[in-house]
């Protein structure tokens, strides 16, 4: 399987909410012995390997934000910890995997990575990740709503925040 990032760039005004999204593509084994570990973290531009560095999102680590479930299950973080930081990660039955960040500030700007690990018995792993950039803007040049730029082309789409 692969991870697709529908949008490679999110440009949002300060104070807005945004949902960053990844999607599992290809054959996903929904077998009884398979578990998926999914998480989000921040990383740095200019690395030799994108997403190799794992930094916290709003002081929450990859383990604070992870989802862990069987191949046929949906999941979401119900952690009070995450929600206190204005964060929630979620996963549905269709391979969509997201993190919602509320009340954005300039400090939220940066590179975000989603990572999916397919885990089989006995402890074998297959890791895939996706990367996207979030730019939070303030002032007169900031958009009124988040603008997203698809990964495949540079056509932008306006989306209204939740």
């Amino acid at each position: 399987f692969k991870v697709a990032t529908p949008y490679s760039l999110y440009v949002c005004p300060e104070g807005q909410n945004v949902t960053l999204t990844c999607r599992l593509l290809g054959p996903v084994d929904k077998g009884h012995d398979v578990t998926f570990y999914k998480t989000w973290y921040r990383s740095s531009r200019g690395e030799v390997q994108t997403c190799s560095e794992r930094r916290p999102i709003r002081n929450l680590t990859f383990q604070d934000l992870h989802l862990h479930h069987g191949g046929h299950q949906a999941a979401n973080t119900s952690h009070d910890l995450a929600q206190r930081h204005g964060l929630e990660s979620a996963s549905d039955h269709h391979g969509n995997f997201s993190i919602t960040m509320r009340n954005l500030t300039l400090l939220d700007s940066g590179l975000y990575c989603c990572l999916v690990v397919e885990i089989r018995h006995h402890h074998s792993e297959h890791r895939v990740h996706g990367a996207m950039e979030l730019q939070v803007q303030t002032g007169k040049d900031a958009p009124s709503n988040c603008v997203v730029y698809p990964s495949s082309s540079q056509d932008s789409e306006n989306i209204t925040a939740a």
Partner: antibody, heavy 120, light 111 residues
């Protein structure tokens, strides 16, 4: 809150079979990763015995493989250890534990341990 | 099997001092940029308690005075300023390869 509790006889005679059960509360043994048995002889270090996966498949330490069986009862949310042909060297505190993943595999929840003495 | 050698076997220090515990593996425990090395604390009559996973990640609820570092074959657990409750035995454990193995332990005692 996940809790594990070992139970079983505290005294086993040499050549007999040691049988222990781990009861899990607060988490389904079919929903997690792997469920393990670990032991610690008196005054010594820790030794991994083996585990059972959420699917029911098992994996054992080669040093004990010929004598070990790990099984489960999903209706009771329990998993069990059987160790045959025991000797005094099998005297130890036996722990059950859950593993978890976070770019390493680790034991995040342990039972409090149960002491098993092999003696006639 | 991967053999983990911990040193020193016993470490005598006073509260407030810095403790440095070492664990050396007989082969690398790294995979895809991560180290499959964990640290546990055990007190007499109690089960081990996870402190550090993946060589450097602090388990939830563990005080920040505990930290882990290292990669490949050499790993270190550091306690920046010892508290009375830190005197215990510490074990490293690898999970890169079956069978999972533990080090022989380092006993941290009050000087």
């Amino acid at each position: 809150q996940v809790q594990l509790q070992e139970s079983g006889p505290g005294l086993v005679k040499p050549s007999q079979t040691l049988s222990l059960t781990c009861t899990v509360t607060g988490y389904s043994i079919t929903g997690g990763y792997n469920w393990h048995w670990i032991r610690q002889p008196p005054g010594k270090g820790l030794e991994w015995i083996g585990d059972i996966h959420k699917s029911g498949s098992t994996n054992y330490n080669p040093s004990l493989k010929s004598r070990v069986t790990i099984s489960r009862d999903t209706s009771k949310n329990q998993f069990s250890l059987k160790l045959s042909s025991v000797t005094a060297a099998d005297t130890a505190v036996y722990y059950c534990a859950r593993d978890y993943y976070g770019f390493s595999w680790y034991f995040d929840v342990w039972g409090q341990g149960t002491t098993v003495t092999v003696s006639s | 099997d991967i053999v983990l050698t911990q040193s020193p076997a016993t470490l005598s220090l006073s509260p407030g001092e810095r403790a440095t515990l070492s664990c050396r593996a007989s082969q690398s425990v790294d995979y895809d940029g991560d180290s499959y090395m964990n640290w546990y604390q055990q007190k007499p009559g109690q089960a081990p308690r996870l402190l550090i996973y993946g060589a450097s990640n602090l388990e939830s609820g563990i005080p920040a005075r505990f930290s882990g570092s290292g990669s490949g074959r050499d790993f270190t657990l550091t306690i920046s300023s010892l508290e009375p409750e830190d005197f215990a035995t510490y074990y490293c454990q690898q999970s890169i390869e079956d069978p999972w193995t533990f080090g022989g332990g380092t006993k941290l005692e009050i000087k």
